[in-house]
């Protein structure tokens, strides 16, 4: 090894990564909200729709104050990976009725991937435990019908909206702790 020499700064640091994650999450939340509204306009939902393979909501108002950095980032990454796979599945399995939303679903998937990359980079830089990416609990088979894929889309977008809403709050809170 040669004499001590400094390294140039890399493009970002963990705090900047967290800022970036917050911005990406907010942007994704707006996209999801808009897409969910489009879905409701085109295919009015008859009540709430659920999908067994979707993750349960990670946070609630009561737990927000006791959040820990590792737990939040790990859970958020696992949940978002599950939503990413569900959006992928929706794009593949969607019938003709959902094809009109293909550009929006494609953009949503790309933004989800960017957010997942950013969260992983943040976890690597902080040296937090890297969770094994979560496979959907239920193998995702083709929807039973065209209406089945519409109900699945309602459930996926609704769940993602709630997850991202809590993610923004959680990440903003974590910013004060890093």
């Amino acid at each position: 090894p040669g004499p001590p020499a400094g390294s140039p700064r890399v493009s970002s640091d963990p705090r900047a990564d967290l800022d970036s994650a917050v911005l990406l999450t907010r942007s994704l939340l707006a996209d999801t909200r808009q897409l969910a509204a489009q879905m409701r306009d085109k295919f009015p939902a008859d009540g709430d729709h659920n999908l067994d393979s979707l993750p349960t909501l990670a946070m609630s108002a009561g737990t927000l104050g006791s959040l820990q950095l590792p737990g939040v980032l790990t859970r958020l990454r696992v949940d978002l990976m599950s939503y990413f796979r569900h959006v992928q599945w929706l794009r593949r399995a969607a019938g003709p009725s959902l094809k009109t939303l293909e550009p929006e679903l494609g953009a949503l998937q790309a933004r989800l991937e960017r957010l997942l990359r950013r969260l992983q980079l943040l976890m690597s830089r902080l040296a937090l435990p890297q969770a094994a990416p979560d496979q959907p609990a239920v193998p995702l088979g083709p929807p039973a019908s065209a209406w089945g894929s519409i109900r699945a889309a309602h459930a996926i977008l609704g769940g993602l909206h709630l997850t991202l809403d809590w993610a923004v709050r959680g990440l903003l809170l974590l910013k004060t702790r890093l």
Epitope: R15, P70, R117, L121
Partner: antibody, heavy 114, light 111 residues
Framework: EVQLLESGGGLVQPGGSLRLSCAAS????????GHWVRQAPGKGLEWVAL????????YYADSVKGRFTISRDNSKNTLYLQMNSLRAEDTAVYYC???????WGQGTLVTVSS | QSVLTQPPSASGTPGQRVTISCSGS?????????VHWYQQLPGTAPKLLIY???ERPSGVPDRFSGSKSGTSASLAISGLRSEDEADYYC???????????FGGGTKLTVL
């Protein structure tokens, strides 16, 4: 400018101990995980140990588990590696690194020989 | 033997494009974990070259690019220059080992 400066290397007999230190400057050390990575003469890089930004998580390569201990003092911007029960195969240049790792020190040579 | 597999050597002439591969498994590269690339010039410490599969730190020329697909990743260097002669290492987190792993390194020779 970011700097990581290792110290504490040297010649030690098999079964002996050494403590490596790494002084960080030029960046917010307390926001980064800290690594030790080694490179035996003429060989490739081998990850040794990793500690989270706040010291709450520690990870070790199987080859050093139970013999090496990683620690950090964020108030001193310093990373440590306590090496016990040293073996000839631990002979290497030991690099301190931070982040992904994004930043690397220049390394300190540890020679284990009788 | 390294967990990530790289060719021991690669070569090219100035101006050429060379690619270095890095093959992993379902517990590292294939598990959605990011791949990072390092350059180690002779007699110096490693330097981060590519992070998060395809992002370049500031100061790294755009001649260097990374990509990832399935359980493999690759580093491409276009417009090869004599100063690119170095050892190149890939790295990724390995879930089964609970830690980062490095490839064995590829020695790049500029002919």
């Amino acid at each position: 400018e970011v700097q990581l400066l290792e110290s504490g290397g040297g010649l030690v007999q098999p079964g002996g101990s050494l403590r490596l230190s790494c002084a960080a400057s030029g960046f917010t050390f307390s926001s980064y995980g800290g690594h030790w990575v080694r490179q035996a003469p003429g060989k490739g890089l081998e990850w040794v140990a990793l500690i989270s930004y706040d010291g709450s998580y520690k990870y070790y390569a199987d080859s050093v588990k139970g013999r090496f201990t990683i620690s950090r003092d964020n108030s001193k911007n310093t990373l440590y590696l306590q090496m016990n029960s040293l073996r000839a195969e631990d002979t290497a240049v030991y690099y301190c690194a931070a982040g992904v790792p994004d930043y690397w020190g220049q390394g300190t040579l540890v020679t284990v020989s009788s | 033997q390294s967990v990530l597999t790289q060719p021991p050597s690669a070569s090219g002439t100035p101006g050429q494009r060379v690619t270095i591969s890095c093959s992993g498994s379902s517990s590292n590269i294939g598990s959605d974990y990011d791949v990072h690339w390092y350059q180690q010039l002779p007699g110096t410490a490693p330097k981060l070259l590519i992070y998060s599969n395809n992002e370049r730190p500031s100061g790294v020329p755009d001649r260097f690019s990374g990509s990832k697909s399935g359980t493999s990743a690759s580093l491409a260097i276009s417009g090869l220059r004599s100063e690119d002669e170095a050892d190149y290492y890939c790295a990724a987190w390995d879930f089964s080992l609970s830690g980062p792993v490095f490839g064995g390194g590829t020695k790049l020779t500029v002919l």
